[in-house]
């Protein structure tokens, strides 16, 4: 720790005196203290001399010597009083700026320690302090207003009793700044606006902050608009509101509107788009394909996006057939508003049944007319297979009927032994039927195909199997010739019930 000579905590001298303060440390040392006139500084290695040959009341203050190279940051200090009978105060600042709830030090330094008993703090022109002003005094540092409030932003003077009369210091302006967390908060209403030419419109830009010092403006396509500003103060916030009223909008009013507010912390801006249209509009669209295929038993949500102005006067989902005259349950229809002019309508179809395949239409109406968007829903089924033995044109023929959606493919297998299903080891022959005959193919129904396998002689210790498959699954039917006649076996696993 550096050492100061003279080695006293306080030094009291008269104006005009010569003062020499010497500081010695292990390494280089530095003096610091309040800005004051007449000092000269002389440094010589590990010592530094601060001196004046004409001390004035302005030299009153605490002088600190530090050793910059000291990792512990040790320092020594001495307080100098220059006792001037005409000047009881050395004021180190014209203004003190603090944030709310910080302590505010008003740096009136007493030039004579004897005067400490008679000091007080007042507002200028002798006005008393505001109620609840909590302050303390230190002859070395001045008056401290504890946890300063914005309302205490005032001009203050320090008062000392000298020979029975009060002597005031020059004034110090205290500025207590509100703690501004950031740029002003902004709202721009509405977030989006559509109007038909000739209609009225209103756009409101408002900004608020804990501090009154902020600016707000509304601009249209980068042009600042001259709008009267309304100011208010509530909930401990200052509010500034700009309202743009348009009685009859035209196309030149359309475009981007930005609400911009700024303060010392920075700038905030938010934007909205104003569309002016010739007439009402109603647009329906879907991100989904309008032709849907779903496996029977599964669920599906049909979604329609609606863009409309003015707002919808009515909407509903309708089932257009072909299977029944049932209508979607209202509880399965859901509407969500994305924003003022865009909505999403959803129809939920859980655990689809065969009778629910068909066309679903969403209808909506506004003053611009009505629109519809129709979905076609086809259900997918795994194949169902059956085999019979018959004679066609005198030839023994195995006839396989397969029904499912999408259209099933058919494969015939001949295998040794009697079995419900041919496995690889038993297979003697395989025939693919690339073009089975389509027996029925109606929209929203299963596709039924037929495949013929001509067999000259039925081998009695063999099995003939018809297999059908599509993207959903597969089905098969095993035909076992028996001496007494043909015998067919649907496979055990074919127990599908939709």
């Amino acid at each position: 720790i550096p050492v100061i000579e003279p080695s006293v905590p306080e030094l009291v001298v008269k104006p005009g005196a010569t003062v020499t303060l010497r500081c010695v440390g292990n390494g280089s040392v530095e003096w610091d203290g309040p800005p004051s006139p007449h000092w000269t500084l002389y440094s010589d290695g590990s010592s530094s001399i601060l001196s004046t040959n004409n001390a004035t009341f302005q030299n009153t203050g605490t002088y600190r010597c530090t050793e910059p190279g000291d990792p512990l940051g040790g320092s020594a200090a001495i307080h100098l009083y220059v006792k001037d009978p005409a000047r009881p105060w050395n004021v180190l600042a014209q203004e003190v700026v603090v944030f709310e709830d910080q302590d505010a030090l008003l740096p009136c330094l007493l030039t004579d320690p004897v005067l400490e008993a008679g000091v007080s703090l007042v507002r200028v022109r002798g006005r008393p302090l505001m109620r609840h002003t909590n302050y303390s005094f230190s002859p070395w540092h001045g008056f401290t207003i504890h946890r300063a409030k914005f309302i205490q932003s005032q001009d203050y003077q320090c008062s000392a009793l000298m020979g029975g009369r009060k002597v005031m210091s020059i004034s110090i302006r205290l500025k207590v700044q509100k703690v501004i967390p950031g740029p002003p908060a902004l709202t721009l209403v509405p977030a989006e606006l559509v109007r038909i030419r000739g209609e009225a419109a209103q756009i409101v830009c408002s900004a608020s902050s804990v501090d009154v010092n902020f600016d707000v403006f509304l601009q249209h396509n980068n042009t600042k608009l001259a709008i009267p500003q309304q100011s208010d103060f509530h909930n401990n916030r200052y509010q500034k509101v700009l309202t743009l009223n348009l009685d009859q909008v035209d196309f030149q009013h359309a475009g981007n509107y930005s609400c911009v507010a700024s303060n010392v912390q920075g700038k905030h801006s938010t934007s909205m788009f104003f569309r002016v249209v010739e007439s009402a509009y109603l647009n329906l669209s879907s991100e989904q394909n309008l032709i849907q295929e779903v496996t029977v038993g599964e669920g599906l949500n049909l979604k329609v996006m609606v863009e409309a102005y003015p707002g919808l006067q009515g909407f509903n989902w309708t089932y257009l057939g072909p299977f029944s005259d049932h209508q979607p349950e209202p509880k399965l229809a859901n509407a969500t508003t994305k924003d003022t002019y865009r909505h999403t309508f959803t129809l939920s179809l859980p655990r689809l049944k065969p009778s629910e395949a068909g066309r679903y239409s969403f209808l909506a109406r506004n003053p611009g007319g009505w629109r519809a968007l129709t979905f076609e829903l086809t259900l997918r089924y795994p194949p169902e297979v059956s085999v019979i033995w018959t004679f066609i044109n005198g030839s023994g023929t195995l006839l396989c009927a397969a029904s499912g959606y999408p259209q099933p493919n058919v494969t015939w297998l001949q295998c040794s032994g009697h079995t419900d299903r041919c496995d690889e080891a038993q297979v003697l022959q395989v025939w693919d039927d690339p073009y089975p005959e389509v027996l029925s193919q109606e929209p929203f129904h299963k596709v039924t195909v037929q495949s013929l396998l001509t067999v000259e002689t039925l081998e009695h210790n063999q099995t003939y199997e018809c297999r059908a498959h599509n993207s959903v699954g597969s089905g098969s039917w095993a035909f076992i010739p028996i001496s007494a006649g043909a015998h067919t076996h649907p496979p055990d696993e074919f127990l599908f019930t939709p």
Epitope: S36, Q58, A93, E95, V96, Q102
Partner: antibody, heavy 117, light 109 residues
Framework: QVQLQESGPGLVKPSETLSLTCTVS????????WSWIRQPAGKGLEWIGR???????NYNPSLKSRVTMSVETSKNQFSLNLSSVTAADTAVYYC???????????WGQGTLVTVSS | QSVLTQPPSASGTPGQRVTISCSGS????????VNWYQQFPGTAPKLLIY???QRPSGVPDRFSGSKSGTSASLAISGLQSEDEADYYC??????????FGGGTKLTVL
């Protein structure tokens, strides 16, 4: 080694407020006086004012009505606000540490502020 | 108009001794110490001399300062090409406001 860094917008519109912040690193802001100095292009230096770590300030009389300085010791930063700016306020603005005999031993590198619409 | 008065320019040849003057009044230089700064184009000023005649560490002893009454001067002996820069004097006035000279552009011929 103490280092100072000025920051703030490089362009300010006339009549608006110029706001700059000086961040001190490599040392504490406490117990020192900190100044703002400016220099218009091709001209000399002008002292704007000083602030102590407790928030006490002194301002150049010619600028006093437009200047506010503040300090945030927790962030090791001090700030300058100059209101109602005109083209005459266009300059490089420096922050610096002021010592007991009025000398500035550490300076920021300076930031150019242009006042223009 | 600067409070302290300096010649706008000065010059010298390498090895020469050059002096730059700074004139003030009793309310600034007369009652307070003088400081000098060196500034190269596009950079911040650098402290050269403080408290009339004190050199910060790292400043060559070719640079020296002096003060007499209300004037001060900066002397550079053994002038070098790297000394070509702007030089400013500075002081406080009676109200402890910082005041600067207008600056002197030093050219090494």
């Amino acid at each position: 080694q103490v280092q100072l860094q000025e920051s703030g917008p490089g362009l300010v519109k006339p009549s608006e407020t110029l706001s700059l912040t000086c961040t001190v690193s490599g040392g504490s802001i406490s117990s020192y006086y900190w100044s703002w100095i400016r220099q218009p292009a091709g001209k000399g230096l002008e002292w704007i004012g000083r602030i102590y770590s407790s928030g006490t300030t002194n301002y150049n009389p010619s600028l006093k009505s437009r200047v506010t300085m503040s300090v945030e010791t927790s962030k090791n930063q001090f700030s300058l606000n100059l209101s109602s700016v005109t083209a005459a306020d266009t300059a490089v603005y420096y922050c610096a540490r002021e010592r007991i005999t009025g000398h500035f031993d550490y300076w920021g590198q300076g930031t150019l502020v242009t006042v223009s619409s | 108009q600067s409070v302290l008065t300096q010649p706008p320019s000065a010059s010298g040849t390498p090895g020469q001794r050059v002096t730059i003057s700074c004139s003030g009044s009793s309310s600034n230089i007369g009652s307070n110490t003088v400081n000098w700064y060196q500034q190269f184009p596009g950079t911040a000023p650098k402290l050269l001399i403080y408290s009339n005649n004190q050199r910060p560490s790292g400043v060559p002893d070719r640079f020296s300062g002096s003060k007499s009454g209300t004037s001060a001067s900066l002397a550079i002996s053994g002038l070098q090409s790297e000394d070509e820069a702007d030089y400013y004097c500075a002081a406080w006035d009676d109200s402890l406001n910082g005041v600067f000279g207008g600056g002197t552009k030093l050219t090494v011929l």
